[in-house]
């Protein structure tokens, strides 16, 4: 059936980047400016996505593929295809309806996006806190208290925690 249809349908010969123009006896016309067709046999070209406002163009539209957007500095993409841009916050903060807010005590966020998460509870794994948590960093768990009892093998003291803002990005 498909083969028969393609023999009868002149539009099936129109390649990507063109459309089958009913106003011109179904000849293949190039897509108008700022539009594209990514497959052959199309009766219309799709209008290109415009990256406006907090969006910026990551990939220009061509006659055969849509534009792609990302976000301007200070914002990051959300959702498939960067459908939304969300404001960045600093490490140690999370975005709320009222803007960026510091993480509450006992929580941290080591990224410019996302929410503050609770510090790891070392005792759940039978371990002790080796390095205290901050707004920007989770706690570091060490050996269990039993491992640190007299006679146990010595533990190399941890390196000092890095200052916030100096951690590798």
């Amino acid at each position: 059936f498909e083969r028969t249809r393609s023999l009868q349908d002149p539009c099936s010969n129109c390649p990507a980047g063109t459309f089958c123009d009913n106003n011109r006896n179904q000849i293949c016309s190039p897509c108008p400016p700022n539009s594209f067709s990514s497959a052959g046999g199309q009766r219309t070209c799709d209008i290109c996505r415009q990256c406006k406002g907090v969006f910026r163009t990551r990939k220009e539209c061509s006659s055969t593929s849509n534009a792609e957007c990302d976000c301007t500095p200070g914002f990051h993409c959300l959702g498939a295809g960067c459908s939304m841009c969300e404001q960045d916050c600093k490490q140690g903060q999370e975005l709320t309806k009222k803007g960026c807010k510091d993480c509450c005590f006992g929580t941290f966020n080591d990224q410019k996006r996302g929410i503050c998460r609770p510090w790891t509870n070392c005792s759940l794994d039978g371990k002790s806190v080796l390095v205290n948590g901050t707004k920007e960093r989770d706690v570091v768990c060490g050996p269990s208290p039993a491992d640190l009892s007299p006679g146990a093998s010595s533990v190399t003291p941890p390196a000092p925690a890095r200052e916030p803002g100096h951690s590798p990005q």
């Epitope: 400016p33 700022n34 219309t44 799709d46 209008i47 290109c48 996505r49 415009q50 406006k52 406002g53 163009t57 959300l78 959702g79 498939a80 295809g81 459908s83 939304m84």
Partner: antibody
Framework: QVQLQESGPGLVKPSETLSLTCTVS????????WSWIRQPPGKGLEWMGY???????QYNPSLKSRVTISVDTSKNQFSLKLSSVTAADTAVYYC????????????WGQGTLVTVSS | EIVMTQSPLSLPVTPGEPASISCRSS???????????LDWYLQKPGQSPQLLIY???NRASGVPDRFSGSGSGTDFTLKISRVEAEDVGVYYC?????????FGQGTKLEIK
Amino acid sequence: QVQLQESGPGLVKPSETLSLTCTVSGGSISSYYWSWIRQPPGKGLEWMGYIYYSGSTQYNPSLKSRVTISVDTSKNQFSLKLSSVTAADTAVYYCARDQSGGGSFQHWGQGTLVTVSS
Amino acid sequence: EIVMTQSPLSLPVTPGEPASISCRSSQSLLYSNAYNHLDWYLQKPGQSPQLLIYAGSNRASGVPDRFSGSGSGTDFTLKISRVEAEDVGVYYCMQALQTPPTFGQGTKLEIK
């Protein structure tokens, strides 16, 4: 070619919730933005909001507290809910494919009239 | 929100004659990429609106070349070089620069 079809009750009582569904055929919903636009009888067009297939939404501030748009990619459908309706919400409701998130509505459904009346 | 104002609101035209509709926006629709975020739609009697012109001047694929759009910034014009009977309906301009997109009041084109 892409076709859109609205469906839902044509009559809704005041204070109730209006619910409509738009079914997309001839193409996947998993791309582009998808909008709802309405037109009261004899009047102009009003954009209500859009959804991206990933679920991101944006609404008209004039309706924001009452409108919810959702998507079901498995059924190639997206839906509109408008709560606490009054007679002023009587309109033809259109679904449309939105090329840029609030711009260039290239494909429209045929529209469905929803009357708000007791 | 951006306010769109069309004129005239009613436009009687003789078939074969040209027609022109004006649309003005309350702020510039020209974006930094030299793209005017202005669309024109035609709603024929009893039908859904259909896109005629996007980006101020680009004819949508399949739209007859008697339709043309021009203008930039805040002032835009839709021209029909030779009106045909099938062109009757209400013409709307719409700004697509800011959310929410907003439409003009509409211009009703009728045949004399």
